[in-house]
């Protein structure tokens, strides 16, 4: 029985079409939310005069249905065993889900101001730009409406700004009508123990984003692993939002709508600094912020992001080190709302249920050029926003995979 | 030793045009931000225009009403002005200054290249 | 924009006296205030930038202080190779702006 049970799993679980897997891979049968909060400034004059602590707010949710797409381009490889795509990207607005439209205004760093002086670090530059910035009105902090924010709005001072430059910003800017990859991954024909794992992102096998085996494009994208997962292992993925490869641990066992299924958890070492880790060391790639590489918590992802100081953290800077969330205030830090998790079914190592949490940060220092930010004593990773992406298998489809996988082994 | 030298000045009849060039000697000519200056005959100096090492991001003061344009090529390591509708007060000398490591404005001149719009 | 008051225009001191020249803005500029020397016949040269900071090879004869409007270039003992028109310039905001210059003439 079992070797049949087993047989047919591996059968199941190949990304081709005809099996369930397949089906469920190239369009996700889960409903797929995310939830967005943004952190409103309380104190921007305060802060732009006299450096003082950030004061924050945060509000939300805001809800967007996400990943509603199915995957596009599909091409089997017989030769290597792989199946390659790309995800197309899509939000919609719900406002049931959601405290506000999207035309709520909010209180937030002005991202063009802030990025301006860390991609352009020479004077004649700043005084340059200086003079736009006023000719603008723009100033450290700006007002804008979440769906600004979010999926982008015209730059006053950018649109300034003498030579060709993309003039609109926005955090997720551009995200609808786009893709994310092309992916090619193992279909798990030939090795069903490396189904779904990553073989390429974007033509290559390396990031190009960091040194050493940091720059490695490891696991799968988290919908699903190799099957018959096992506690001890340590589970990878590659999170094209974070731009960097990422594992989770065995943190429990739950039951999700009648299945059992292992939880498995992002572990604060993967944040740590490479003291206290010093496999994290390829991930400090800048030494003053990161006081000499001994922060934690935030990732610099820059390289990634054309040169925009943009660092990513985990909510509300959850396993961050002091320093980062000192000039914060209004921050609070909770392992169960904040960390990310994963909740695999172990025989066929499918994701059942997941919340993916992360925040975005801008870097701002003080750049005596730059009339807007020249009174800061300090530099700030200054959080802007949190997101929860959760999806959680839907009652019919529990019950289809219990008739079909579970129910068939107890 | 960084060594500048301008050229095209002469003397022109007001509304002509001209084309200065300043040439450099240095290797690292497409690493540093560059200007061209003025002194006028009342002993006045003036910034005329500036251009930053990749040619992406030049200024003009508003007083030079945009009848002047910098560029570069930084494979001939060579700074140029093209200067349009000449008028008697654009007679000057003309020098082309290279901005400091640290972006210091005008760290270095060349010898300069006298223009003279006159009827 | 930042207008700038030099003074005096013109200047006639002996060798080894205390040179000293004044640059006035008409708004808060740090201290981003710049002093040029230019001799008969030659180019500019920049003496002090930014942040009162001689340039490598300027004679430490040569000297500024200021900060925000206030400004002041000095030559502690005056020699005759000092002869020369001596401009300042405020970098910290466009348009740049030149004082219009101090004859520093031999007594």
């Known amino acids: 029985g079992d070797m049949l049970i087993e047989k047919t799993i591996k059968r199941e679980v190949v990304l081709e079409e005809g099996t369930t897997a397949f089906k469920n891979w190239v369009k996700t049968g889960t409903t797929v939310y995310r939830q967005f909060w943004i952190f409103d400034v309380q104190n921007p004059d305060d802060v732009a005069k006299n450096s003082s602590k950030i004061k924050v707010k945060q509000r939300g949710p805001y809800t967007y249905r996400v990943r509603y797409l199915a995957k596009e381009n599909i091409t089997q490889d017989p030769e290597d065993h792989t199946v390659s795509f790309v995800q197309p990207n899509g939000a919609i607005f719900e406002p049931s889900l959601s405290v506000g439209t999207e035309d709520d205004n909010f209180t937030v760093l002005n991202l063009a101001v802030a990025a301006a002086p860390h991609i352009y670090q020479n004077s004649f530059v700043q005084v340059v730009l200086n003079s736009l910035i006023k000719k603008s009105k723009s100033s450290m902090f700006q007002t804008r409406s979440l769906k600004e924010l979010l999926w982008g709005y015209k730059d006053p001072f950018l649109s300034l700004v003498p030579y060709p430059i993309s003039t609109t910003v926005g955090v997720f800017y551009p995200y609808n009508d786009t893709v994310d990859g092309v992916y090619k991954v193992f279909n798990g024909k030939d090795n069903i123990s490396k189904v779904a794992i990553i073989e390429s992102y974007k033509g290559k096998r390396n990031l190009s984003y960091w040194p050493s085996y940091c720059d490695m494009i490891n696991g799968t994208d988290a919908a699903s692993f190799p099957p018959f997962v096992e506690k001890s292992r340590t589970l990878r993925f590659f999170s094209s939002d974070i731009c960097r490869s990422i594992y989770a641990v065995f943190g429990s066992e739950i039951d999700l709508k009648g299945i059992p299924v292992y939880r498995f958890v992002l572990p604060a070492n993967a944040f740590a600094s490479p003291l206290q880790n010093p496999d994290n060391h390829c991930f400090c790639t800048e030494k003053v912020i990161s006081n000499n590489c001994t922060s934690y918590g935030v990732l610099d992802i820059g390289k990634c992001k054309e040169g925009k100081p943009v660092y990513i953290s985990l909510p509300h800077f959850l396993h961050a080190s002091p320093d980062v969330s000192e000039p914060i205030e209004g921050l609070h830090p909770n392992e169960d709302e904040h960390r990310t998790y994963l909740d695999v079914e172990p025989i066929t190592g499918f994701t059942l249920q997941f919340a993916k949490r992360l925040q975005v940060n801008i870097l701002v220092k003080p750049a005596r050029k730059i009339e807007a930010l020249k009174n800061l004593k300090r530099p700030y990773i200054v959080p802007i926003l949190w997101l929860n992406e959760t999806g959680t298998i839907g009652d019919e489809k529990a019950e289809m995979f219990k008739t079909q996988v579970t129910g068939k082994i107890k | 030793e960084v060594q500048l030298v301008e050229s095209g000045g002469g003397v022109v009849q007001p509304g002509e045009s001209l084309k200065l060039s300043c040439e450099s000697n240095?290797?690292?000519?497409?690493?540093?931000?560059m200007s061209w200056v003025r002194k006028t005959p009342e002993r006045r100096l003036e910034l005329v225009a500036a251009?930053?090492?990749?040619?992406?991001?030049?200024y003009y003061p508003d007083t030079m009403e945009r009848r002047f344009i910098i560029s570069r090529d930084n494979t001939k390591k060579t700074l140029y002005l093209q200067m349009s509708s000449l008028k008697s007060e654009d007679t000057a000398m003309y020098y082309c200054a290279r901005h400091g490591q640290t972006g210091t404005w005008f760290a270095y001149w060349g010898q300069g290249t006298l223009v003279t719009v006159s009827a | 924009e930042t207008t700038v008051t030099q003074s005096p225009a013109s200047l006639s001191m002996a060798i080894g006296e205390k040179v000293t020249i004044r640059c006035i803005t008409s708004t808060d500029i740090d201290d981003d205030m710049n002093w040029y020397q230019q001799k008969p016949g030659e180019p500019p040269k920049l003496l002090i930038s930014e942040g009162n900071t001689l340039r490598p090879g300027v004679p430490s004869r040569f000297s500024s202080s200021g900060y925000g409007t206030d400004f002041v270039f000095t030559i502690e003992n005056m020699l005759s190779e000092d002869v020369a028109d001596y401009y300042c310039l405020q970098s910290d905001n466009l348009p740049l702006t030149f004082g219009a210059g101090t004859k520093l003439e031999l007594k």
């Open positions: 240095e290797y690292e000519f497409p690493s540093h931000d």
């Open positions: 251009i930053n090492s990749d040619g992406a991001i030049t």
